[in-house]
């Protein structure tokens, strides 16, 4: 089971600021697909 989360359990102000600047849902999706690829799934279940 693979889950992608829009928020974080950790204090990640950089991530929060990027999220706040994304202008559309498509930007949001693209950014998180990038994140998932860069961290190899990040332990999602």
């Amino acid at each position: 089971k693979h889950k992608c989360f829009r928020n974080s359990l950790e204090n990640n102000e950089t991530l929060e600021s990027i999220m706040n600047t994304l202008e559309s849902e498509e930007d949001f999706r693209k950014y998180f697909y990038y994140l998932e690829g860069s961290k190899g799934g990040g332990g999602s279940k």
């Epitope: 889950k3 928020n7 359990l9 950790e10 929060e16």
Partner: antibody, heavy 128, light 107 residues
């Protein structure tokens, strides 16, 4: 039925340590993030710490960062909170809570921090 | 951190009354808001999440609405078991934060 039972609270002197435990039953423990939330008697709720299903993501409130450590043992369906360097302001009722991991169909993403199952709480008193 | 403010802090009402509690966020949180009910000596109970989604088993007299910075919890017809303290909580971002609570007492 779904149940969370906390233990380990008590009276402790400032600067000392305490370890809280939470025993989970009635649900697939390793499917969900878990949290600790505290409440000073007669006051509001304060999120303390959270941990995802495999301990790969962990967060703390600024007020406890560097002093408290959250952990879990999925094989034993247990959640823990190691509390070091305790202060008088840590005096509170500590609740263990399960995250629902809400799925937002509009965005296609999950969200942490909605807590649908809570234990009865364990009292921590820090006093000399 | 996002600050959550509830109004009123204290509310006196009678059985059968329609009760509305308001919660404000210090910045926009979309619909990422939950409501909890807490009775004396008991743990909080999840009532509503995502602003308006009723948690399983919660009576339909409870409803939630709002988005952005202003949210409301409404009890359409107050029942004896509804006298409790209600908290809003944002789950938009780290750290999750709660309102100070609204105590609903019997008039």
């Amino acid at each position: 039925q779904v149940q969370l039972v906390e233990s380990g609270g008590g009276l402790v002197q400032p600067g000392r340590s305490l370890r809280l435990s939470c025993a989970a039953s009635g649900f697939t423990f390793d499917d969900y993030a878990m949290h600790w939330v505290r409440q000073v008697p007669g006051k509001g709720l304060e999120w303390v710490s959270g941990i995802n299903w495999n301990s790969g993501s962990i967060g703390y409130a600024d007020s406890v960062k560097g002093r408290f450590t959250i952990s879990r043992d999925n094989a034993k369906n247990s959640l823990f909170l190691q509390m070091n360097s305790l202060r008088a302001e840590d005096t509170a009722l500590y609740y263990c809570a399960k995250d629902i991991e809400y799925y937002d169909i509009l965005t296609g993403y999950y969200s942490y921090y909605i807590m649908d199952v809570w234990g009865q709480g364990t009292t921590v008193t820090v006093s000399s | 951190d996002i600050q959550m403010t509830q109004s009123p802090s204290f509310l006196s009402a009678s059985v059968g009354d329609r009760v509305t509690i308001t919660c404000w966020a210090s910045q926009g949180i979309s619909s990422y808001l939950a409501w909890y009910q807490q009775k004396p000596g008991k743990a909080p109970k999840l009532l509503i999440y995502a602003s308006s989604t009723l948690q399983s088993g919660v009576p339909s007299r409870f409803s939630g609405s709002g988005s952005g910075t202003e949210f409301t919890l409404t009890i359409s017809s107050l029942q004896p078991e509804d006298f409790a303290t209600y908290y809003c909580q944002q789950f938009n971002s780290y750290p999750p934060t709660f309102g100070q609570g609204t105590k609903v007492e019997i008039k």
